[in-house]
């Protein structure tokens, strides 16, 4: 069963290799349990990023080393990917599923363009 | 294609206890909340118990809270119940169900009796 | 006594248009949840004939049609056809129940 999954066209990583961004569901129920799935598309190729499963009202819990961070109000999740590098350039893609109570809603987002930019080397500094 | 085989039903004294399973093929079983839903013969359709995806929450109708446990094993794609005390009012087929009743199998017919 | 109240039976000629009712409650209904209709013909399982208030899946025709309002639903059918005399059940997640309601089926004949 589809559900709209809305999230930014662009975004660019910070210096620190830093990305955020915002996935928003709209909910055609009452979900208590929402799973939420970070997917990489690079030359047509998917791999998930991370996951998370977490209760309505309590904070996204990924697995410990996972470079994904996240929180959630209402119907929005705020999606933080970490330790990003040059080569991670490529599209990201929010996916929303409603596990609890049922029935089971899906949606999968249009994606995110993440661009990152490898900082340049400091160069030596002569005193 | 969606297939939801029950089987253990059969004919048990009352009192006595009996075991349906639930092998589901055809989708992602481990995403979806499982249930059982009964019929009795000649009558409505009653949700006996349901249990969520990984699960955490399980539910039960007053009629079986205390008798029946429902369980599953998603790495078998099974779903389980385990129906104790047995009461000449358990008698009905028994149907699987996946997700809010999207699918059902075929039943199986449980019938307790003396 | 069913959480849902649905009316035992309904007739209608075939080509007419007919309505069954589904009223529930706050922790059903009335909660936002969606309502889900079935199907039951003579000697088989259910099959499920809407899903979230007004869906069709695949392979059910465009006669059958929901709606849902307040803490109601009903299912419409129209252009009645002989092979749609069957029972009909509607149900909804129930947060009190903390599982699902059905309603107590409406037996659907189709007169002459």
């Known amino acids: 069963k589809a559900m709209h999954v809305a999230q930014p066209a662009v975004v660019l990583a910070n210096s620190r290799g830093t990305a955020s961004f915002v996935c928003e569901y709209a909910s055609p129920g009452k979900a208590t349990e929402v799973r939420v799935t970070v997917l990489r598309q690079a030359d047509s190729q998917v791999t998930e990023v991370c996951a998370a499963t977490y209760m309505m009202g309590n904070e996204l819990t990924f697995l410990d080393d996972s470079i994904c961070t996240g929180t959630s109000s209402g119907n929005q999740v705020n999606l933080t990917i970490q330790g990003l590098r040059a080569m991670d350039t490529g599209l990201y893609i929010c996916k929303v599923e409603l596990m609890y109570p049922p029935p089971y809603y899906m949606g999968i987002g249009n994606g995110t363009q993440i661009y990152v930019i490898d900082p340049e080397p400091c160069p030596d500094s002569d005193f | 294609e969606v297939q939801l085989l029950e089987s253990g039903g059969g004919l048990v004294q009352p009192g006595g206890s009996l075991r349906l399973s639930c092998a589901a093929s055809?989708?992602?079983?481990?995403?979806?909340?499982m249930s059982w839903v009964r019929q009795a013969p000649g009558k409505g359709l009653e949700w006996v118990s349901g249990i969520s995806w990984s699960s955490r929450d399980k539910g039960y109708a007053d009629s079986v809270k205390g008798r029946f446990t429902i369980s599953r094993d998603n790495s078998k794609n099974t779903l389980y119940l385990q129906m104790n005390s047995l009461r000449a009012e358990d008698t009905a087929v028994y149907y699987c169900?996946?997700?809010?009743?999207?699918?059902w199998g075929q039943g199986t017919l449980v019938t307790v009796s003396s | 006594q069913s959480v849902l109240t649905q009316p035992p039976s309904a007739s209608g000629t075939p080509g007419q248009r007919v309505t069954i009712s589904c009223t529930g409650s706050s922790s059903n209904i009335g909660a936002g949840y969606d309502v889900h209709w079935y199907q039951q013909l003579p000697g088989t399982a259910p099959k499920l004939l809407i899903y979230?208030?007004?869906n069709r899946p695949s392979g059910v025709p465009d006669r059958f049609s929901g709606s849902k309002s307040g803490t109601s639903a009903s299912l419409a059918i129209s252009g009645l056809r002989s092979e749609d005399e069957a029972d009909y059940y509607c149900a909804v997640w129930d947060d009190s129940l903390n599982g699902v309601v059905f309603g107590g089926g409406t037996k659907l004949t189709v007169l002459g």
């Open positions: 169900t996946t997700d809010l009743a999207r699918y």
């Open positions: 055809g989708f992602t079983f481990s995403d979806y909340y």
């Open positions: 979230g208030n007004d």
